[in-house]
């Protein structure tokens, strides 16, 4: 054996953002021929010996960080990248608006503003079709998301979520969609 066994992949299907009471499947995938998997929920001391975890109805207690490994012979693989499973719909939806407005000229600037009546300190913005949240290096997880020098690629449908840093995997319902039009 030269070097550690390669890490498996861990994914959530259909998405790692799961509305409460909706189903989700966590799947750990290693090399062909591997059948001994361990799927762990971090910070909970628990694990199961299967590659697939089917959750028929998402609960608050199932939100959190997951990781998996596999065993080949007596050797363990490197762990997968952590998967963050988020329960959405735990709190009421925030509102999403665009300043100065949802129609913006190419090359112009726009700021997407996520507002909630709760005292949340964290916000996530998603663009429809993108699996990962919109990340602005300066203002990730803030209430406002400035988009400097808008291009046609920025046009699309956006939604935001709000949550607390104390419970980072329990999110609000998504805001109503906001259509950003680049002219």
């Amino acid at each position: 054996q030269s070097g550690p066994l390669p890490k498996p992949s861990l994914q959530a299907l259909p998405s790692s953002l799961v509305p409460l009471e909706k189903p989700v499947t966590l799947r750990c995938q290693g090399p062909p021929g591997v059948d001994l998997y361990r799927l762990e929920k971090l910070s909970s001391s628990r694990y199961q010996d299967q590659a697939v975890l089917f959750i028929p109805a998402m609960k608050r207690s199932l939100a959190g960080r997951y990781r998996c490994s596999y065993q080949n012979g007596s050797l363990w693989s490197l762990p997968s990248d952590q998967l963050e499973l988020v329960a959405t719909g735990v709190f009421a939806k925030p509102s999403l608006s665009a300043q100065p407005g949802p129609a913006v000229s190419s090359g112009g600037d726009v700021t997407l503003q996520c507002q909630t009546r709760y005292g949340f300190d964290q916000f996530a913005l998603y663009k429809e079709g993108d699996p990962a949240p919109y990340k602005n290096p300066e203002r990730w997880y803030r209430a406002s998301f400035p988009i400097i020098t808008v291009t046609a690629a920025h046009s699309g449908t956006y939604r935001c979520y709000s949550f607390s840093s104390r419970d980072p995997y329990l999110w609000s319902a998504p805001s109503d969609p906001l259509e950003l039009v680049v002219t």
């Epitope: 361990r38 910070s43 001391s45 363990w76």
Partner: antibody
């Protein structure tokens, strides 16, 4: 109530072999991970080996790998530890311990322990 | 040499509060694994005292509490009683080879 009773300990010469057994009762044995944990005289606890509920997942401490073999017989509600090539430093009380389980999840801690069986390796 | 580090001994007078620390690394406690604590009274097998960093099994008095932060954890005992005199062990899991790891143990002496 949950009971774990170890047996098979005794005096053995260096290089010799011994087989420990742990008889489990009062719970569904086949649902739980099980481990052997040892404690040298006057020293702390050292995890030795664990086996998954179906006997597929097996792990050993580096200090015993290649010399000790853990196994289980779910039909007999029994856990075993075959110890070969014994050394003086293997002298210890050997405990059988159950891992907590809830629904489909196993947990990384031990909720019940046996009273232990003493293994002495000496010439 | 234990993977998790505990002080060899602590002591306190009856009624006092004592804490026992448990320090690990980024491959065990810092890798998202919880810390569990066991009490071993003289001449007996270990008994689960705290699981999942801060949870008490039924029957364990609320004088015992646990916490975890980063790569370390601690066990606090308030209102010390003579029957608390025992060895205390922390335990976690290590990601490297999926092994269970213990601290070296701490002997608690109740003075007087």
């Amino acid at each position: 109530q949950v009971q774990l009773v170890e047996s098979g300990g005794g005096l053995v010469k260096p290089g010799g072999s011994l087989r420990l057994s742990c008889a489990a009762s009062g719970f569904s044995f086949s649902d739980h991970y099980m481990s052997w944990i040892r404690q040298a005289p006057g020293k702390g606890l050292e995890w030795v080996s664990s086996v998954g509920s179906e006997g597929k997942f097996i792990d050993y401490a580096a200090s015993v790998k290649g010399r000790f073999t853990i196994s289980r017989d779910n039909a007999k509600n029994s856990l075993y530890l075959q110890m070969n090539s014994l050394r003086a430093e293997d002298t210890a009380v050997y405990y059988c311990a159950r891992h907590y389980r809830e629904f489909r999840w196993h947990y990384y801690y031990f909720d019940y322990w046996g009273q232990g069986t003493l293994v002495t390796v000496s010439s | 040499q234990s993977v998790l580090t505990q002080p060899p001994s602590v002591s306190g007078a009856p009624g006092q509060r004592v804490t026992i620390s448990c320090t690990g690394s980024s491959s065990n406690i810092g890798a998202g694994y919880d810390v569990h604590w066991y009490q071993q009274l003289p001449g007996t097998a270990p008994k689960l005292l705290i699981y999942g960093n801060s949870n008490r099994p039924s029957g364990v008095p609320d004088r015992f509490s646990g916490s975890k932060s980063g790569t370390s954890a601690s066990l606090a005992i308030t209102g010390l009683q003579a029957e608390d005199e025992a060895d205390y062990y922390c335990q976690s899991h290590d990601l490297g080879a999926h092994v269970w790891v213990f601290g070296g143990g701490t002997k608690l002496t109740v003075l007087g």
